[in-house]
């Protein structure tokens, strides 16, 4: 039975040209995390494999940085970066846990961070 929950940074906003940290945290399970995938629109941005460590997709190498922790840093943001991001925790023996973050990239300098929320 899957008992874990993923806490994410929730709905967040950031300024065009700036950077943002996407964070997820898996709790309430003793399952072993084998790999974490960061995705946008069904495309892998990065993976963090328990054995091999961090890898940024060749297509995103110039604008994506690993961490902190199992999070992901997006740099040089453009309005095209607005959208849904997913952290997918592949675990054993539980299976897959998915967290969702919505990022809005704003032209103005009035970018405020949304509240944290939980996905069961």
């Amino acid at each position: 039975m899957m008992t874990g929950t993923i806490e994410t940074t929730g709905n967040i906003s950031a300024e065009k040209g700036g950077s943002i940290i996407l964070q997820c945290h898996l709790s309430s399970t003793t399952a072993q995390v084998t790999q974490v995938n960061w995705e946008q629109q069904d495309q892998l941005l990065a993976i963090c494999n328990a054995d091999l460590g961090w890898h940024i997709s060749p297509s995103f190498k110039d604008r994506v940085a690993p961490g902190p922790g199992l999070g992901l840093t997006l740099q040089s943001l453009t309005v095209n970066d607005t959208g849904e991001y997913f952290c997918i925790y592949h675990t054993y023996p539980d299976g897959t846990y998915t967290g969702r973050i919505f990022l809005e990239v704003l032209e103005s300098s009035v970018a405020e961070h949304g509240a944290r929320f939980q996905i069961p």
Epitope: T34, Q35, N37, E39, D42, Q43, L44, I47, N49, D51, L52, G53, H55, S57, P58, H90, T96
Partner: antibody, heavy 122, light 107 residues
Framework: QVQLVQSGAEVKKPGASVKVSCKAS????????MHWVRQAPGQGLEWMGI????????SYAQMFQGRVTMTRDTSTSTVYMELSSLRSEDTAVYYC???????????????WGQGTLVTVSS | DIQMTQSPSSLSASVGDRVTITCRAS??????LNWYQQKPGKAPKLLIY???NLQSGVPSRFSGSGSGTDFTLTISSLQPEDFATYYC?????????FGQGTKVEIR
């Protein structure tokens, strides 16, 4: 041009170990992950593990954990796969295969070695 | 681990036929699906990566489609050199896993 050249066929007794080599040429050795895949006679393809030639980090399939060791020698652009405690079911052709994308371990395998037949028989 | 299931396991076809092989993943792998061709006594050869991208040097009669859990390899007009075994493989998560193979034989 990219080439992966493997060592020759081996015959081993049950309980022994085998070490297969795979020499790479035609590209920057440390930039691409290398996988090992085996194929028993008349059977399908089975992934064994992966090595990062740059840092030497490895990940092994669960079923080979504790029996397989993958290493590399950057001075000769060679990767090695050692399998211990051999049994008859390990009789197979063993392939090294390069990942398709630079420093990305999940891109598909674009170049393969010619294969090394390992026969385990008493 | 993600299970990959191919169908059919074998098929008979004639030169010029349109051939379709399907591959199903036990969970969504987005579009991270590769297809290989293997001839007897030879190493596998990458045909298609990321579900639909043709590997360099592969004839355009080969095409791939699908996303999520269901994928298809199509050979539009089977040629004599296409009689072989075809494998799908997911490259979404380590360990990468293969389907059991589909053998394409001459009718």
């Amino acid at each position: 041009q990219v080439q992966l050249v493997q060592s020759g066929a081996e015959v081993k007794k049950p309980g022994a170990s085998v070490k297969v080599s795979c020499k790479a040429s035609g590209y920057t050795f440390t930039s691409y992950y290398m996988h090992w895949v085996r194929q028993a006679p008349g059977q399908g393809l089975e992934w064994m593990g992966i090595i990062n030639p740059s840092g030497g980090r490895t990940s092994y399939a669960q079923m080979f954990q504790g029996r397989v060791t993958m290493t590399r020698d950057t001075s000769t652009s060679t990767v090695y796969m050692e399998l211990s405690s051999l049994r008859s079911e390990d009789t197979a052709v063993y392939y090294c295969a390069r990942d398709r994308e630079e420093q990305w371990p999940v891109g598909g395998f674009d170049y393969w070695g010619q294969g090394t037949l390992v026969t385990v028989s008493s | 681990d993600i299970q990959m299931t191919q169908s059919p396991s074998s098929l008979s076809a004639s030169v010029g036929d349109r051939v379709t092989i399907t591959c199903r993943a036990s969970q969504s792998i987005r579009r991270y699906l590769n297809w290989y061709q293997q001839k007897p006594g030879k190493a596998p050869k990458l045909l298609i990566y990321s579900a639909s991208n043709l590997q360099s040097g592969v004839p355009s009669r080969f095409s791939g489609s699908g996303s999520g859990t269901d994928f298809t390899l199509t050979i539009s007009s089977l040629q004599p050199e296409d009689f072989a075994t075809y494998y799908c493989q997911q490259s979404y998560i380590i360990p990468p896993t293969f389907g059991q193979g589909t053998k394409v034989e001459i009718r």
